[in-house]
């Protein structure tokens, strides 16, 4: 075991937060400020991510882990690890090259990000529109027209209100 260990790369003993320093006989040296090593055995440390401008710091860099950024209010993260910040829009809008634009008729967006999506086509499921769509909300589909024939309703009517102290007839 000792023989195997001595044949190993001496750098493999350097823990996270250090680098294997070739200038100092491969001893483990601490990462400089504003840098980190998240795994052992590294020959250099990595520069900490800096959250500047529209990015703000969600988690500070440490000697063993990179900083994590999110976006300032009015923006949201895009991409792996919040690599980009994109402007928020209002519900009922989408972001275009010219800024936030209202959803076209027949489309909606119920979030501050993303694109306007077409209203659900109730008739494709053989249903009717129960509540009309808006720029911010999708349509609500109700029962199919066939279900609304006299005497057959799949929409349960509300129970009649009773006055206190009266028993049902």
């Amino acid at each position: 075991f000792e023989r195997t260990r001595s044949l190993q790369d001496p750098c493999s003993n350097c823990p996270a937060g250090t680098f294997c320093d070739n200038n100092r006989n491969q001893i483990c040296s601490p990462c400089p400020p504003n840098s980190f090593s998240s795994a052992g055995g590294q020959r250099t440390c990595d520069i900490c991510r800096q959250c500047k401008g529209v990015f703000r710091t969600r988690k500070e860099c440490s000697s063993t882990s990179n900083a994590e950024c999110d976006c300032t209010p009015g923006f949201h993260c895009l991409g792996a690890g919040c690599s980009m910040c994109e402007q928020d829009c209002k519900q009922g809008q989408e972001l275009t090259k010219k800024g936030c634009k209202d959803c076209c008729f027949g489309t909606f967006n119920d979030q501050k990000r993303g694109i306007c999506r077409p209203w659900t086509n109730c008739s494709l499921d053989g249903k009717s529109v129960l509540v009309n769509g808006t720029k911010e909300r999708d349509v609500v589909c109700g029962p199919s027209p066939a279900d609304l024939s006299p005497g057959a309703s799949s929409v349960t009517p509300p129970a009649p209100a009773r006055e206190p102290g009266h028993s049902p007839q």
Epitope: F19, N23, P32, P33, T44, D46, I47
Partner: nanobody, 122 residues
Framework: EVQLLESGGGLVQPGGSLRLSCAAS????????VGWVRQAPGKGLEWVSA????????YYAESVKGRFTISRDNAKNTLYLQMSSLRAEDTAVYYC???????????????RGQGTQVTVSS
């Protein structure tokens, strides 16, 4: 060739002060990220302080914040570490260090000097 020559160490009583100097040659301290590391007896190297982003920010280890001050004299190409309220745990060899940024994105540091011994004892 990069050279770093530390001086100013010595024996001081707890609560006392010292100013360490690092005379640099082969590079310009005002244009690079530079600092101080130390090695206490039987321990590994520890970062103490640094001037980063070409002077835009400074770093201090938690253990020295409020007691140590890093500065530099561009005309003399010299880095300083003013140490006050010294404690026994500050006893170490102090090395001047130049942070090196490699083309591939890696970061290391150089300590070319012999260091200067600081001993805090009554």
């Amino acid at each position: 060739e990069v050279q770093l020559l530390e001086s100013g160490g010595g024996l001081v009583q707890p609560g006392g002060s010292l100013r360490l100097s690092c005379a640099a040659s082969g590079f310009t301290v005002s244009a690079e990220d530079v600092g101080w590391v130390r090695q206490a007896p039987g321990k590994g190297l520890e970062w103490v302080s640094a001037i980063l982003d070409s002077g835009g920010s400074t770093y201090y280890a938690e253990s020295v914040k409020g007691r140590f001050t890093i500065s530099r004299d561009n005309a003399k190409n010299t880095l300083y570490l003013q140490m006050s309220s010294l404690r026994a745990e500050d006893t170490a060899v102090y090395y001047c260090a130049r942070i090196v940024y490699h083309a591939g994105g890696g970061v290391t540091f150089d300590t070319r000097g012999q260091g200067t011994q600081v001993t805090v004892s009554s």
